[in-house]
Interface confidence: low
C-alpha cells in the first residue's frame, strides 16, 4: 500500500521537510502532489510525467517545492501556513489511481521569553503577584521554574491562561525567587532571564542581644536590636518608657544600679507601616546572678529512733545568700525536736523519731536566684521487740 512519511513530522519554521513515499508502484505514468486531504486541481502543487521526466508546477506551487523521481517532495524554508495535509496521487500504467495522504506541523523557532509582573514590590501576607510569560504564541507549552526547580505543589501557586500566568497568592518573604518561564514547542525551547521579587515584610518582633539580664556595676552595657524586615527596620530605644536614641545599638558605659530598668527596642518599617517592640529587663547588682548548687551532708544517714540525734549540714561557697530546709516538700523546722543553727546551715534533729525518716534537701537563695541540693535519705530504725513465748525465730 502506498504511504507517505514526513521527515521530520515536526518542522521548525524556516527549515525543510521531506515528504517521503513508500511502496511506490512500479508501472507508472506519472504522479501529482496536492495541498490538502484530497485531490483538487486548484490545489495542485506539482505534477511529474515519468516518460518525459518533466515536472509541471501547479496553482499551489510556491517555488519552494522540489519533486524527485521517487515521488518524494521536498519543501524548503517552511512557514506555519505550510502546516497540514498533503496528498499524493499516482497514475499507474493500468490507469488505476492510487492516493496517499501525509501531514507535518510547522512550529516557530521560539524567541527568548520575558516575564511581566503586576507587582514587583509586594507586601508579605497581603499582596498577590501575577507573572505572565510573554509573548503569547500558539501551540506553545509554558513552564515555570522557581529557584531553578519546577513548580512545587502549593495552594498559593496558581497557573492560569494556559499556564502562561503564574499567580502567587499572599506572598511571603521566601517567595523572592528567582522566577523563570520557559516556552516550548516540538522544535524549540527557550527560557527567560530570571526575575526576582522584592517582598516587603516586617518588622518581625525584635530580638535584643545579648540575652544577659544581670550586670555588675561598672560594666559597659551594650545592647543590639534586630528585627527581620524589608526594607530594613528603623530602630529606637526607650529606657523605662523614656525615648533615648534612634539607633540599632545602645551603649551605656560604666553602669550603676540606677541603670536597672526596662529597655525597650522599637522597630519600624516605613513601607509596611508596621511597628514591633521588645522589652528587656536589665538588673545591675553586686549579687551573683547564678547561685551554685549547695552540698548536703548528714552526720549519719541511718539512726535509731528515740535514741539517736542527727545533724544535716548545707554547704555553699556563695556569699550573701540565705538557706532554707525541706522535708517531704514541707518547710522546716516542723517540730520542737528540730533546730537550725549557724545561719541555717545546720539542721539538728534530737531525738530522731520514726516520722523523721525520709528525704531532706536544702535550698540556697538570694533576691535574684536560688538553687537546691540533691536530696539525702534519712533512715530510722527501731530495736526489735522481744519474741513472744520465748520462741526463737525460725
Amino acid at each position: 500500500q502506498l504511504t507517505t512519511e514526513s521527515m521530520p513530522f515536526n518542522v521548525a519554521e524556516g527549515k525543510e521537510v521531506l515528504l517521503l513515499v513508500h511502496n511506490l508502484p512500479q508501472q507508472l505514468f506519472g504522479y501529482s502532489w496536492y495541498k490538502g486531504e484530497r485531490v483538487d486541481g486548484n490545489r495542485q502543487i506539482v505534477g511529474y510525467a515519468i516518460g518525459t521526466q518533466q515536472a509541471t508546477p501547479g496553482p499551489a506551487n510556491s517555488g519552494r517545492e522540489t519533486i524527485y523521481p521517487n515521488a518524494s517532495l521536498l519543501i524548503q524554508n517552511v512557514t506555519q501556513n505550510d502546516t497540514g495535509f498533503y496528498t499524493l496521487q499516482v497514475i499507474k500504467s493500468d490507469l488505476v489511481n492510487e492516493e496517499a495522504t501525509g501531514q507535518f506541523h510547522v512550529y516557530p523557532e521560539l524567541p527568548k521569553p520575558s516575564i511581566s509582573s503586576n507587582n514587583s514590590n509586594p507586601v508579605e501576607d497581603k499582596d498577590a503577584v501575577a507573572f505572565t510569560c510573554e509573548p503569547e504564541t500558539q501551540d506553545t507549552t509554558y513552564l515555570w521554574w522557581i529557584n531553578n526547580q519546577s513548580l512545587p505543589v502549593s495552594p498559593r501557586l496558581q497557573l492560569s491562561n494556559g499556564n502562561r500566568t503564574l499567580t502567587l497568592l499572599s506572598v511571603t518573604r521566601n517567595d523572592t525567587g528567582p522566577y523563570e518561564c520557559e516556552i516550548q514547542n516540538p522544535v524549540s525551547a527557550n527560557r527567560s532571564d530570571p526575575v526576582t521579587l522584592n517582598v516587603t515584610y516586617g518588622p518581625d518582633t525584635p530580638t535584643i542581644s545579648p540575652s544577659d539580664t544581670y550586670y555588675r556595676p561598672g560594666a559597659n552595657l551594650s545592647l543590639s536590636c534586630y528585627a527581620a524586615s524589608n526594607p530594613p527596620a528603623q530602630y529606637s530605644w526607650l529606657i523605662n518608657g523614656t525615648f533615648q536614641q534612634s539607633t540599632q545599638e545602645l551603649f551605656i558605659p560604666n553602669i550603676t544600679v540606677n541603670n536597672s530598668g526596662s529597655y525597650t527596642c522599637h522597630a519600624n518599617n516605613s513601607v509596611t507601616g508596621c511597628n514591633r517592640t521588645t522589652v528587656k529587663t536589665i538588673i545591675v547588682t553586686e549579687l551573683s546572678p547564678v547561685v551554685a548548687k549547695p552540698q548536703i551532708k548528714a552526720s549519719k544517714t541511718t539512726v535509731t529512733g528515740d535514741k539517736d540525734s542527727v545533724n544535716l549540714t548545707c554547704s555553699t561557697n556563695d556569699t550573701g545568700i540565705s538557706i532554707r530546709w525541706f522535708f517531704k516538700n514541707q518547710s522546716l523546722p516542723s517540730s520542737e525536736r528540730m533546730k537550725l543553727s549557724q545561719g541555717n546551715t545546720t539542721l539538728s534533729i534530737n531525738p530522731v523519731k520514726r516520722e523523721d525518716a525520709g528525704t531532706y534537701w536544702c535550698e540556697v537563695f538570694n533576691p535574684i536566684s536560688k538553687n537546691q541540693s540533691d536530696p539525702i535519705m534519712l533512715n530510722v530504725n527501731y530495736n526489735a521487740l522481744p519474741q513472744e513465748n520465748g520462741l526463737s525465730p525460725g
Epitope: E182, V187, A189, N190, R191
Partner: antibody, heavy 121, light 111 residues
Framework: EVQLLESGGGLVQPGGSLRLSCAAS????????MSWVRQAPGKGLEWVSV????????YYADSVKGRLTISRDNSKNTLYLQMNSLRAEDTAVYYC??????????????WGQGTLVTVSS | QSVLTQPPSASGTPGQRVTISCSGS????????VSWYQQLPGTAPKLLIY???KRLSGVPDRFSGSKSGTSASLAISGLRSEDEADYYC???????????FGGGTKLTVLG
C-alpha cells in the same frame, strides 16, 4: 536516583568501529539534552558531542566530525555514540553526561561512570 | 591546547582559601555561562558550580564561583584534605558551536 550507565567500550584496531550506549534511569530522559565527554589517560576532559532532548539539534567537536555520530532513542531511554574510522587519539574513557538546562546554560549535572575505548593495533 | 586556560596546579594548607582561575574569550566565557567540575582520582567528574556562580544542591558553601568579562574563577575556602582533586572549568563556545573545557587544575592540600 539518576543513573547513567555506559557500555560498549573495549579494544579496537585503528580504522575500526565501535558503538557506545548510555542507559539512563531515574529521570525523564526525553526532557534532557545529552552529551558525550571523553578523557584520554592522564589528560583533561574533552567534549565530544551533544544532542538536544528531541534529537533535532546535534553538534560535534571538530576533532570527531564525520567519524562519530550521536543519536538517541527516547523510547528506550538510551543515548548512543557510533564511532567509525577510529584513531589512536580516540583512546579515552567516554562519559555520557546530562544537561539539565536543555542547552540554555549548558552544564553537566550527572555523569556516568565511563567506558574505556582503546584504539590500538 | 585547551580553549579555556587554567593553571596546571594549585595548592594550599588546610583551612586556607585557594582560587583557581579560568581564562577564555568573548565567544565562550564572555557570552556564555561557566561551570566548574571536581574530579576526584579514579572517579567521574562532579558538577560544583553552574551558571557562573550557582552552587549545585549539596555542594558545600565553601565552594564559590564568579565571573568577570572573559575570565572566571573558583574559590575554595576552609580548605580540606578531601578537596584534593582535579578541577575543570567549562562553557559553551558560540563560535565553535561546542562545549569547551579548561585543561584542568590539580589542587594539592599540603600538610
Amino acid at each position: 536516583e539518576v543513573q547513567l550507565l555506559e557500555s560498549g567500550g573495549g579494544l579496537v584496531q585503528p580504522g575500526g568501529s565501535l558503538r557506545l550506549s548510555c542507559a539512563a534511569s531515574g529521570f525523564n530522559f526525553s526532557n534532557y539534552a545529552m552529551s558525550w565527554v571523553r578523557q584520554a589517560p592522564g589528560k583533561g576532559l574533552e567534549w565530544v558531542s551533544v544532542i538536544s532532548h528531541g534529537g533535532g539539534s546535534i553538534y560535534y567537536a571538530d576533532s570527531v566530525k564525520g567519524r562519530l555520530t550521536i543519536s538517541r532513542d527516547n523510547s528506550k531511554n538510551t543515548l548512543y555514540l557510533q564511532m567509525n574510522s577510529l584513531r589512536a587519539e580516540d583512546t579515552a574513557v567516554y562519559y555520557c553526561a546530562r544537561d539539565p538546562t536543555k542547552g540554555y546554560a549548558p552544564t553537566f549535572d550527572y555523569w556516568g561512570q565511563g567506558t574505556l575505548v582503546t584504539v590500538s593495533s | 591546547q585547551s580553549v579555556l586556560t587554567q593553571p596546571p596546579s594549585a595548592s594550599g594548607t588546610p583551612g586556607q582559601r585557594v582560587t583557581i582561575s579560568c581564562s577564555g574569550s568573548s565567544s565562550n566565557i564572555g557570552n556564555n555561562y561557566v561551570s566548574w567540575y571536581q574530579q576526584l582520582p579514579g572517579t567521574a567528574p562532579k558538577l560544583l558550580i553552574y551558571a557562573d556562580s550557582k552552587r549545585l544542591s549539596g555542594v558545600p558553601d565553601r565552594f564559590s564561583g564568579s565571573k568577570s568579562g572573559t575570565s572566571a574563577s573558583l574559590a575554595i575556602s576552609g580548605l580540606r584534605s578531601e578537596d584534593e582533586a582535579d578541577y575543570y572549568c567549562g562553557a559553551w563556545d558560540g563560535r565553535l558551536n561546542g562545549y569547551v573545557f579548561g585543561g584542568g587544575t590539580k589542587l594539592t592540600v599540603l600538610g
